[in-house]
């Protein structure tokens, strides 16, 4: 469906004559009849298959026709059609003289025709006007024309119906070619599918209107990307809904059993950091200067011989300090103020000057090293100590300081943690994969059975005859204070009656 529009612009009839050559009296009062029809190679009379339209009297003899579309007038002339525009047409425009007010064909004399033009050709649908001018011996007509689609019709031949909508059945406007253009926030073939909140999880979230994110069961959060753990889960998380994966230090079905050995037992000494590594096991990360399973052993930072050029090392609370020999300075006595003239090379090292004597380099004999050949070659560089043992240079030799649980020249032998009898007060020691555990006798507790927990020896009511019972805390035994008339360690004998001994 569309409209063929014809805009008449100018008609010239300077002599004011009819087609017959006869002049109009007093002038040619001119109106037009338009016939639009299917394409004909030779335009011939017959039905105006695409439509007809007539104008009122537009002027006399020669005149310009003003554009009257804005005022609701009839220029451009409208020839609507209710079919697919074929792309070709034939057009007949007749100019007639109106002697009176009746413009009906039957009311006009047959010789009232002023001029007749006929054109045919191709015409694509579009907004642009095609300008044309037709001239006969006596007249000239200038006009333009175009084909546009009716409202809600689109495409090359106005055959595509598209009506914008914003309701349950779609949310779109129409493009010039009749395709749908979804309103913001909608997608899909008919723009019925809302675009969810940006980032809304594809599987776990959905939406019923644009820019929202509704969560499916078991999911939550702004983007429905956080799972909800199993109901009752206390110290756990999930990667899929209703799981309960325990946080570090917690166990049990609902992650409500505390496995945080570090917090409850504080086993690490000397400011070390404690890390739980499973039920009842832990790892201590020692501060510099300490070693041992519980960081209970103090290291000398001077053991690594940090002072160069014969500097002597002094241990300090927060590290060490190098006392440099004359001619050296720096944190490790690494800077020299000497030259070869000062004979700075020890142990038979030979001196070579550098930078025009500004400084020097020592070439050391075997078994000595250091910038001044002041150090014996460190026998610890090959890391001879096994199982985390610490290598210490001791004069001409070396020794390994072993971690607890290891022994041997190179700490290569594994010692049972229980070998050093760590459990106090007769506790029973059990070797574990990550250490040891003490089973304490009655009256003692703690990791090493070092805590005395007093036993109430009177709890079993050992005293007879209403005697008062006292616990001896030093021996965890009881003492009975007998009432008058009774004796014996448990006040079991009346006074005057000798005990009956079995012998």
């Amino acid at each position: 469906s569309g409209v063929f529009q014809l805009q008449l612009q100018e008609f010239i009839n300077e002599r004011g004559v009819l087609a017959s050559g006869r002049p109009c009296e007093p002038g040619c009062r001119t109106f037009f009849r338009v016939c639009l029809k299917h394409f004909q190679a030779v335009v011939s009379p017959g039905p105006c298959t695409f439509g007809t339209v007539s104008t009122p009297v537009l002027g006399t003899n020669s005149f310009a026709v003003r554009d009257d579309s804005s005022g609701g007038g009839r220029n451009p002339l409208q020839l609507p059609f209710n079919f697919t525009w074929p792309g070709t047409f034939s057009l007949i425009i007749e100019a007639w003289h109106a002697p009176g007010d009746d413009l009906r064909p039957e009311a006009l004399p047959p010789d009232a025709l002023i001029s007749k033009i006929a054109i045919q050709g191709s015409l694509a649908v579009g907004q642009n006007w095609l300008l044309d001018e037709q001239t006969s011996t006596l007249t000239r007509l200038r006009y333009s024309y175009r084909v546009i689609c009716s409202d809600n019709y689109y495409g090359d031949n106005c055959s595509r119906l598209c009506k914008k909508r914003n309701d349950h059945f779609g949310h779109y406007v129409c493009q010039p070619d009749g395709n749908l253009s979804c309103l913001p926030g909608w997608t899909g073939e008919y723009c019925q599918q809302p675009i969810c909140l940006s980032g809304c999880h594809e599987q776990n979230g959905y939406c019923s209107k644009p820019a929202e994110c509704l969560c499916r069961p078991g999911w939550q959060g702004r983007l429905c990307n956080e799972c909800i753990p199993h109901n009752g889960c206390r110290h756990g998380t999930c990667s899929t809904p209703w799981q309960c994966t325990c946080d570090e230090g917690w166990g049990g079905l609902f992650c409500d059993q505390d496995l945080n050995y570090c917090t409850h037992h504080s086993p690490c000494k000397n400011g070390a950091t404690c890390s739980n590594s499973g039920q009842r096991s832990y790892t201590c990360t020692c501060r510099p200067g300490y070693t041992g399973v519980d960081c209970e052993l103090e290291l000398s930072e001077c053991d690594s011989n940090p002072c160069r050029n014969g500097g002597s090392c002094k241990d300090q609370e927060d590290g060490y300090h190098c006392l440099c020999p004359p001619g050296y300075y720096g944190l490790h006595c690494e800077h020299s103020t000497l030259s070869c003239a000062d004979s700075p090379c020890f142990n038979g090292g030979s001196c070579r000057e550098r930078n025009q004597g500004a400084n020097y380099a020592c070439e050391c004999p075997p078994n000595f090293t250091g910038s001044n050949c002041e150090k014996k070659v460190d026998r610890c560089t090959s890391n001879p100590c096994a199982n985390g043992g610490q290598c210490l240079n001791r004069g001409p030799s070396r020794m390994c300081r072993c971690r607890p649980g290891f022994t041997g020249t190179y700490c290569e032998l594994h010692v049972s943690d229980c070998a050093r009898n760590p459990c106090a007060h007769g506790g029973t020691c059990h070797d574990l994969e990550n250490g040891l555990m003490c089973t304490c006798p009655a009256g003692f507790s703690g990791r090493r059975c070092e805590v005395r927990t007093s036993i109430d020896a009177c709890a079993s009511s050992p005293c007879f005859n209403r005697a008062t019972c006292y616990t001896d805390l030093s021996t965890d035994t009881f003492v009975c204070n007998c009432p008058y008339g009774f004796v014996g360690s448990r006040c079991e004998f009346p006074v005057g009656l000798p005990p009956s001994f079995p012998w």
Epitope: L197, A211, E212, C213, L214, Q220, R222, L223, C224, I228
Partner: nanobody, 123 residues
């Protein structure tokens, strides 16, 4: 059975403060995001603030940003809303809720609501 019980509302002068509480039961409170919603007389529900399950992320409507603070105590199964510099337009019934869906500004669909507590700001 899920229960959300709000308290702490009342009459307060403009510029004053109130602290609302929401006691939760019947579900594992610490596993769920929570939200505060308000409804003024003759108006629809308006999202106020939200907090994630762990309490590390908080969200506020533009109308309350900088004046209200949401928090939670998972050990006590309680949600809080500290309201400072209150204005007459804050007058409403305030409810805590478990959000089920979010829009571009905040939660707008809820799995459960409490009955609410009335807050009136007037001189």
């Amino acid at each position: 059975e899920v229960q959300l019980v709000e308290s702490g509302g009342g009459l307060v002068q403009p510029g004053g403060s109130l602290r609302l509480s929401c006691a939760a039961s019947g579900f594992t409170f610490g596993s769920y995001d929570m939200s505060w919603v308000r409804q003024a007389p003759g108006k629809g529900p308006e999202w106020v603030s939200a907090i994630n399950s762990g309490g590390g992320s908080t969200y506020y409507a533009d109308s309350v940003k900088g004046r209200f603070t949401i928090s939670r105590d998972n050990a006590k199964n309680t949600l809080y809303l500290q309201m400072n510099n209150l204005k007459p337009e804050d007058t409403a019934v305030y409810s805590c809720a478990i959000p089920r869906g979010w829009g571009p500004t905040g939660p707008h669909e809820y799995a459960y609501w409490g009955q609410g507590t009335q807050v009136t700001v007037s001189s």
